[in-house]
């Protein structure tokens, strides 16, 4: 009996035309939502003039439906038992699941001022930038709509720069009508224990963002894992959102719509400094902001963002060192709300429910040459927003799962 079930599972989780796995893999049957909370800055003038702590107040959720588009350019390679694809990006605003509209205004860090002053270091260039910031009436902070902040707007200061610079900025710009990949993953035909594991991303086995093992593309994309998952396993996966591979460990047994699943969570150790977790030494890319690699809980992904000083963390700086959150008032981290988890059905390896939580922050530094940053007396890693991307298997699919998979075993 068990052998027959194993054989059936092995057959059905292969990523090829005709299997249950393939149908759900090409286009997810689960509705996936991405909720945003924006950190509205309450005291912009005090920060700019006196280098005060930044007082933030989160506003949200603002909810978008995402991951509703089918994978594109799906191509099987029989020779190396892989399947390659592009994952198209799309987001549809859901007013009924949101506290306001895409036209709501927020006071946030001026993305262009923070990024340009960080990247363009030449003394003469900084003088030009300063005059253009003043000319465009730009400042350290700005008021932007949700739509502008997320999806992009033409920046008035960058538009005056007399060089071919990027003049449109936004935290997720460009997004709609773009795609992530090309991913090339093992289809499991020759070896089921490799199914869904990424072979290459954008044609390479490494990212070129990090040194040593930190640069590796490990595991799957977290939508599924090879079947027969054990509680003792460390599940590796790659997330292009955070420009790195990461891992999850077993936390607890959960009953999801009558289906026994394993809850795997991202442990605090994954965000620790190299002092506590030596494996993380290669995620420390510079010495000053990281206080000689002793800070933890923030990841500098600037190399992955064309040099823009983007730092990824967990929401509200959960699992981050006190020095990171000290200059920010109004944060309340808690595990239940702000950690990431995956609920995995162990027989198939399918992720039936997940909550992926992350925060996007931008570094802003004092600058002698740039007037609006002149009074700053310290560096700030400024929270802009945090997001919660969730998906749960639908009732119909859960019934099918219970009858065809878990029901047959129990």
């Amino acid at each position: 009996g068990d052998l027959l079930i194993q054989k059936t599972i092995k057959k059905q989780v292969v990523l090829e035309e005709g299997t249950i796995a393939f149908k759900n893999w090409v286009k997810t049957g689960t509705e996936v939502y991405r909720q945003f909370w924006i950190f509205d800055v309450q005291n912009p003038q005090e920060v700019m003039m006196n280098s005060s702590n930044i007082q933030v107040k989160q506003r949200g959720p603002y909810t978008y439906r995402v991951r509703f588009l089918a994978k594109e350019n799906v191509t099987q390679d029989a020779e190396d038992n892989t399947v390659s694809f592009l994952q198209p990006n799309g987001a549809i605003f859901e007013p009924s699941l949101s506290v306001g509209t895409e036209a709501d205004n927020f006071t946030v860090l001026n993305l262009a001022v923070a990024a340009a002053s960080h990247i363009y270091q030449n003394q003469f260039v900084q003088m030009i930038l300063n005059s253009l910031i003043n000319k465009s009436k730009s400042s350290m902070f700005q008021v932007r709509t949700l739509r502008e902040l997320l999806w992009g707007y033409r920046d008035p200061f960058l538009s005056l720069v007399p060089y071919p610079v990027t003049t449109t900025v936004g935290l997720f710009y460009p997004y709609n009508n773009t795609a992530d990949g090309v991913y090339k993953v093992f289809n499991g035909k020759d070896n089921i224990s490799k199914v869904a594991i990424i072979d290459t991303y954008k044609g390479k086995r490494n990212l070129s963002y990090w040194e040593s093992h930190c640069d590796m593309i490990n595991g799957t994309d977290a939508a599924s894992f090879p079947p027969f998952v054990e509680k003792s396993q460390v599940l590796q996966f790659f997330s292009s959102d955070i420009c790195r591979s990461i891992y999850a460990v077993f936390e607890s047994d959960v009953n999801l719509k009558g289906i026994p699943v394993y809850r795997f969570v991202l442990p605090s150790k994954a965000f620790a400094s190299p002092v506590e977790n030596p494996d993380n030494y290669c995620f420390c890319t510079e010495k000053i902001i990281s206080k000689n690699c002793t800070s933890y809980g923030v990841l500098d992904i600037s190399k992955c963002k064309e040099g823009r000083p983007v730092y990824i963390s967990l929401p509200h700086f959960l699992y981050a060192s006190p020095d990171v959150s000290e200059p920010i008032d109004g944060l309340n981290p808690n595990e239940e709300e702000h950690r990431t988890y995956l609920d995995i059905e162990p027989i198939t390896g399918f992720t039936l429910q997940f909550a992926k939580r992350l925060q996007v922050n931008l570094l802003v530094k004092p600058s002698e040459k740039i007037q609006v940053l002149k009074n700053l007396k310290r560096n700030y890693i400024v929270p802009i927003l945090w997001l919660n991307e969730t998906g749960t298997i639908g009732d119909e699919k859960a019934n099918m799962f219970r009858s065809q998979v878990t029901g047959k075993i129990n």
């Epitope: 990024a115 990247i119 363009y120 270091q121 030449n122 003469f124 260039v125 030009i128 720069v161 007399p162 060089y163 071919p164 610079v165 990027t166 064309e306 040099g307 823009r308």
Partner: nanobody, 120 residues
């Protein structure tokens, strides 16, 4: 590859003149802002004069205004610094710099420097 070659430095008496030249190769000269910096022993490198790629608003540090003049000849891929009424405090190594911006990148190139000594 990119090269910036300074020339024209030397020893000059106070009140004298020198004309520094910097000839560029390996990049599109007309797309770059060109600057002259100087560094005196034990001091930080200082921006002396700069001219944008289009020859627009020229910058001079206060201490050289009215004495130094920067110009560029895009046909010859060369930037000049005419230095008049030289003072002992102008003694330094003078460096040529080329910079442009493209996308989110800054392309910043430096010459090896030429020594200017103002002494009687």
């Amino acid at each position: 590859q990119v090269q910036l070659q300074e020339s024209g430095g030397g020893l000059v008496q106070p009140g004298g003149s020198l004309r520094l030249s910097c000839t560029a190769s390996g990049f599109t000269f007309s797309s770059y802002a060109m600057s002259w910096y100087r560094q005196a022993p034990g001091k930080e490198r200082e921006l002396v004069a700069a001219i944008p790629h289009d020859g627009g608003s020229i910058y001079y540090v206060d201490s050289v205004k009215g004495r130094f003049s920067i110009s560029r000849d895009n046909a010859k891929n060369t930037v000049y610094l005419q230095m008049n009424s030289l003072k002992p405090e102008d003694t330094a190594v003078y460096y040529c710099n080329a910079v442009t911006l493209q996308g989110w990148r800054e392309y910043d190139y430096w010459g090896q420097g030429t020594q200017v000594t103002v002494s009687s």
